[in-house]
Amino acid sequence: AITEAREEAKPYPLFPGPFPGSLQTDHTPLLSLPHASGYQPALMFSPTQPGRPHTGNVAIPQVTSVESKPLPPLAFKHTVGHIILSEHKGVKFNCSISVPNIYQDTTISWWKDGKELLGAHHAITQFYPDDEVTAIIASFSITSVQRSDNGSYICKMKINNEEIVSDPIYIEVQGLPHFTKQPESMNVTRNTAFNLTCQAVGPPEPVNIFWVQNSSRVNEQPEKSPSVLTVPGLTEMAVFSCEAHNDKGLTVSKGVQINIKAIPSPPTEVSIRNSTAHSILISWVPGFDGYSPFRNCSIQVKEADPLSNGSVMIFNTSALPHLYQIKQLQALANYSIGVSCMNEIGWSAVSPWILASTTEGAPSVAPLNVTVFLNESSDNVDIRWMKPPTKQQDGELVGYRISHVWQSAGISKELLEEVGQNGSRARISVQVHNATCTVRIAAVTRGGVGPFSDPVKIFIPAHGWVDYAPSSTPAPGNADPVLII
């Protein structure tokens, strides 16, 4: 007989196989079962006997020969129904059909689990023509089977718009257990139970699971997959893995580390990013988090002055962004600063303390007891005051700024005078007669100008008037703020 080969998927070579139907594997399969027989062991190949009905799709040709004899129904011959083989082995299976020669252009396609197999597959169709019929054998081979090759394979042929479908050939690839779920690393609370999960599949089934903790077997009697291990609690870090066993052998999962949550390590590298008169911006590098995320941090601030009462100011902030602006500080003061952070377990120790200083600021209060009177003989206005309390100068006094505003008949002009730090009095020339002079004084440091005092007004009469009564602001009580922690 002439053999014609049509390659369904180029460029694979021809794989001629024994006619009329064959199964070839690199190693004899463990078990091969005809599909229609409900998976009872049977011969690997059982060709359809003449005249025997067939369970697959059958096409009944309407065409008759010259003698008007009806053609027999077309159907694929029975072949092996179930092939079991090990991973990485080769397998070859086929379907065969005899087609009357009156049909032209018959092609056979392979389908797996309802999807047509296209492209680079080892699929070959061989034709064996005879006087009246052509035997067609479609072979499918896989050189090294993988789990993904598991499934139900069928052949399809189209004739006269009719589709003929073969019985399925079930391919079962067996191998070592394959993990579908492995234990995962966790951070757990000391002496608190937790669960780990392990799941592996065959075929072959069943898959049995052993758990291993720090290289000791937890369960000497295996559990069927999937397995959940309840660990009754740990006092120190442990490594867990699971072993999956089936008839093909053993697969070991990755080892996972289970850490015990602890209090964090103290922050390190506390540093000063910026200082002003009343605030300090600090940053820090967080310590080890103790396997539990930081929740918040506490900044502890104490005056470095040995004469201070040693009270500690505490500022709480979020753990991120490792940055905090400490406010409400005194100007030109020294502070010790430490940082502590917490997680769900507790607070870290305090970081190493660092020294930081605030800069000079503008005074926070105005000069006190401002008194203004007119010295008419010299045509001057005399101004006297008391300097603000040292604590509220917020720096070294460099002088005072005097604002005097002259108002008369709709005209207003403001003049500023600077006075050295030693004085507590000043004299300004009368600018306008028959006018009101409003005086305000502010203390000045290198940090800036403080607030102006409450305005003190004095009337400057026209020439010839005499008014010795001074104008003044009352001296307030002790306005020092007291911060109590």
């Epitope: 002496n191 758990w211 903790q213 720090n214 000791s216 937890v218 369960n219 000497e220 009697q221 295996p222 291990l229 309840t230 009754p232 609690g233 006092t235």
Partner: antibody, heavy 118, light 106 residues
């Protein structure tokens, strides 16, 4: 509740054999291993080994290899300990104990006293 | 194999007192289990995996420790607590028991 019920006391002569039974109830027998523990008179506890109730494979500690045999009849949820060629020093109470994860013996039989005396 | 040494061998105390029983392993173990045995009875599981109370055991029993040193504590002794106590290690086969501590009424 889980129960392990052992067979009664035995008095045997040296060289004889004895078979102690341990019947389990109120749990799936083949899910947990079964251990055997020996306690000589006035002494402490000695773990003899265990049997896999699913596969039937026994494991013996070094001191109990040879004359001691663990077996099962899963159809009646029963484990057995057989001792052959009995010696006077085999005189002890033998306990079966259910064997769970982490080597915990969570339920115990009431014990079977085996006395070997001529 | 791992040797477990229990101390003291005998502990004489009165009801209401606190009992502390020690179990030391010859090398580090994963967990320690504790059993109570009364005369003529089978042992009963008290504490498993070092610190977990077994089902039906009163809360006056507690366990602690790690590595090689483990402790069973009975916070306030009741008359029914006078018995022999055994520790048993998990972590290295074969599993071994300690020699026992006899807790007796003073």
């Amino acid at each position: 509740q889980v129960q392990l019920v052992q067979s009664g006391s035995e008095l045997k002569k040296p060289g004889a054999s004895v078979k102690v039974s341990c019947k389990a109830s109120s749990y799936t027998f083949t899910t947990y291993g079964m251990s055997w523990v020996r306690q000589a008179p006035g002494q402490g506890l000695e773990w003899m080994g265990w049997i896999n109730t699913d596969s039937g494979v026994p494991t013996y500690t070094d001191d109990f290899k040879g004359r001691f045999v663990f077996s099962l009849d899963t159809s009646v949820s029963t484990a057995y300990l057989q001792i052959s060629s009995l010696k006077a020093e085999d005189t002890a109470v033998y306990y079966c104990a259910r064997y769970t994860n982490y080597g915990v013996f969570d339920y115990w039989g009431q014990g079977t006293l085996v006395t070997v005396s001529s | 194999e791992i040797v477990l040494t229990q101390s003291p061998a005998t502990l004489s105390l009165s009801p209401g007192e606190r009992a502390t029983l020690s179990c030391r392993a010859s090398s580090s173990v994963g967990y320690m289990h504790w059993y109570q045995q009364k005369p003529g009875q089978a042992p009963r599981l008290l504490i498993y995996a070092t610190s977990n109370l077994a089902s039906g055991i009163p809360a006056r029993f507690s366990g602690s420790g790690s590595g090689t040193d483990f402790t069973l504590t009975i916070s306030r002794l009741e008359p029914e607590d006078f018995a022999v106590y055994y520790c048993q290690q998990w972590g290295s086969l074969p599993f071994t028991f300690g020699g026992g501590t006899k807790l007796e009424i003073k």
